[in-house]
């Protein structure tokens, strides 16, 4: 008779390991399904029920990933005015921001916008800087503007410019987390920033 296929969760045979895309849950003492990269374990497995996976919400990424899935979803960084996206965020990595180089600008607070070139003017009314496009005196620039470049001056942020910008001030996703002592941290002596 062929061996039966074991469906998760199941107790592994003594001396054996869990299969590919499974992990051994110490609490349940069972082989359970891993969540796919970028997903988090919404509900961890028990002796009778398998892992329930969920993705981090749009605009968030997995900051703390583990073999059983994501432990902590976090909002993607937003690059402030004067800074653009150097490396986009992925399911498991945050956005990396960089200062806009001379001749480029970003006037948005965004987790997707890159630095764009200043428009080229016949006569410059206001020179561009890292957080503002150039303003021309003539009605149109000599060369076609970069796609999406702005004609009118934008308000310059008065806040200090950080290369580590603002996450969304929205409510966190409900992530289940295995704590050492139930709902509260241990007496002596957590995860996140």
């Amino acid at each position: 008779l062929p061996a039966q296929v074991a469906f998760t969760p199941y107790a592994p045979e003594p001396g054996s390991t869990c299969r590919l895309r499974e992990y051994y849950d110490q609490t349940a003492q069972m082989c359970c399904s891993k969540c796919s990269p970028g997903q988090h374990a919404k509900v961890f497995c028990t002796k009778t029920s398998d892992t329930v996976c969920d993705t981090c919400r749009p605009g968030w990424y997995c900051a703390l990933s583990k073999q059983e899935g994501c432990r902590l979803c976090a909002p993607l960084r937003k690059c402030r005015p004067g800074f653009g996206v150097a490396r986009p965020g992925t399911e498991t990595s945050d956005v990396v921001c960089k200062p806009c180089a001379p001749g480029t600008f970003s006037n948005t607070t965004s987790s997707t916008d890159i630095c764009r070139p200043h428009q080229i003017c016949n006569v410059v009314a206001i020179p561009g800087n890292a957080s503002m496009d150039a303003v021309c005196t003539s009605t149109s620039p000599t060369r076609s503007m970069a796609p999406g470049a702005v004609h009118l001056p934008q308000p310059v942020s008065t806040r200090s410019q950080h290369t580590q910008p603002t996450p969304e001030p929205s409510t966190a996703p409900s992530t289940s987390f295995l704590l050492p002592m139930g709902p509260s941290p241990p007496a002596e002596g957590s995860t996140g920033d």
């Epitope: 583990k66 902590l72 976090a74 603002t166 409900s174 992530t175 241990p186 957590s190 995860t191 996140g192």
Partner: antibody, heavy 121, light 111 residues
Framework: EVQLLESGGGLVQPGGSLRLSCAAS????????MSWVRQAPGKGLEWVST???????YYGASVRGRFTISRDNSKNTLYLQMNSLRAEDTAVYYC???????????????WGQGTLVTVSS | QSVLTQPPSASGTPGQRVTISCSGT????????VNWYQQLPGTAPKLLIY???QRPSGVPDRFSGSKSGTSASLAISGLRSEDEADYYC???????????FGGGTKLTVLG
């Protein structure tokens, strides 16, 4: 017993470098974000940096670009590489574990005893 | 200057109730949960209250936290001499993408 033990502090000249280590024990190290918090002599607490997995890290404005946080999960150790040190970096540096039930609910729940870094010529 | 504002000192006699305030903004206290830390003289800080009003196991119920809008408070009832310490509030700040602390309040137990 859950424990964090910092090392690597000492006297360094301005412009110099130093690497702090924090050895963790008594818990599953890679389940947690880890942080560095410092306290200048006679002053209050100042957050320095936090790391989650990989290079998912955050830095305080006063150290960004000079300090680098990293972790070695196989060694249960957290590091802080401090470059271009200044007199104002003189402080006791604490390693702290970050408890998280969600992004909005986080706290430093375990602290080490601290290691003193003195930047002086 | 600290992002979160605390009174530099507070005092009370044994058995009294003392409250320490912590004032912030919409990007820190209002948007995120507040934690309180106790630092006894010559020791490392210890988590006292997390998630606005939760006590870790081992922290006496004489300590309680509350939050309203952009302000938070730590209350200590039945004050004891061993409560003499520095107390710090802290919260994540969305605008700074970092943790911010209050300047600390030195609590003195009189008598």
């Amino acid at each position: 017993e859950v424990q964090l033990l910092e090392s690597g502090g000492g006297l360094v000249q301005p412009g110099g470098s130093l690497r702090l280590s924090c050895a963790a024990s008594g818990f599953t190290f890679d389940d947690y974000g880890m942080s560095w918090v410092r306290q200048a002599p006679g002053k209050g607490l100042e957050w320095v940096s936090t790391i989650y997995s990989g290079d998912n890290a955050y830095y305080g404005a006063s150290v960004r670009g000079r300090f680098t946080i990293s972790r070695d999960n196989s060694k249960n150790t957290l590091y802080l590489q401090m470059n271009s040190l200044r007199a104002e970096d003189t402080a006791v540096y604490y390693c702290a574990r970050v408890y998280s039930s969600s992004w909005r609910k986080r706290a430093f729940d375990i602290w080490g005893q601290g290691t003193l870094v003195t930047v002086s010529s | 200057q600290s992002v979160l504002t605390q009174p530099p000192s507070a005092s009370g006699t044994p058995g009294q109730r003392v409250t320490i305030s912590c004032s912030g903004t919409s990007s820190n206290i209002e948007s995120n949960t507040v934690n309180w830390y106790q630092q006894l003289p010559g020791t490392a800080p210890k988590l006292l209250i997390y998630s606005d009003n939760q006590r870790p196991s081992g922290v006496p119920d004489r300590f309680s936290g509350s939050k309203s809008g952009t302000s938070a408070s730590l209350a200590i009832s039945g004050l004891r001499s061993e409560d003499e310490a520095d107390y710090y509030c802290a919260a994540w700040d969305d605008s700074l993408s970092g943790w911010v602390f209050g300047g600390g309040t030195k609590l003195t137990v009189l008598g």
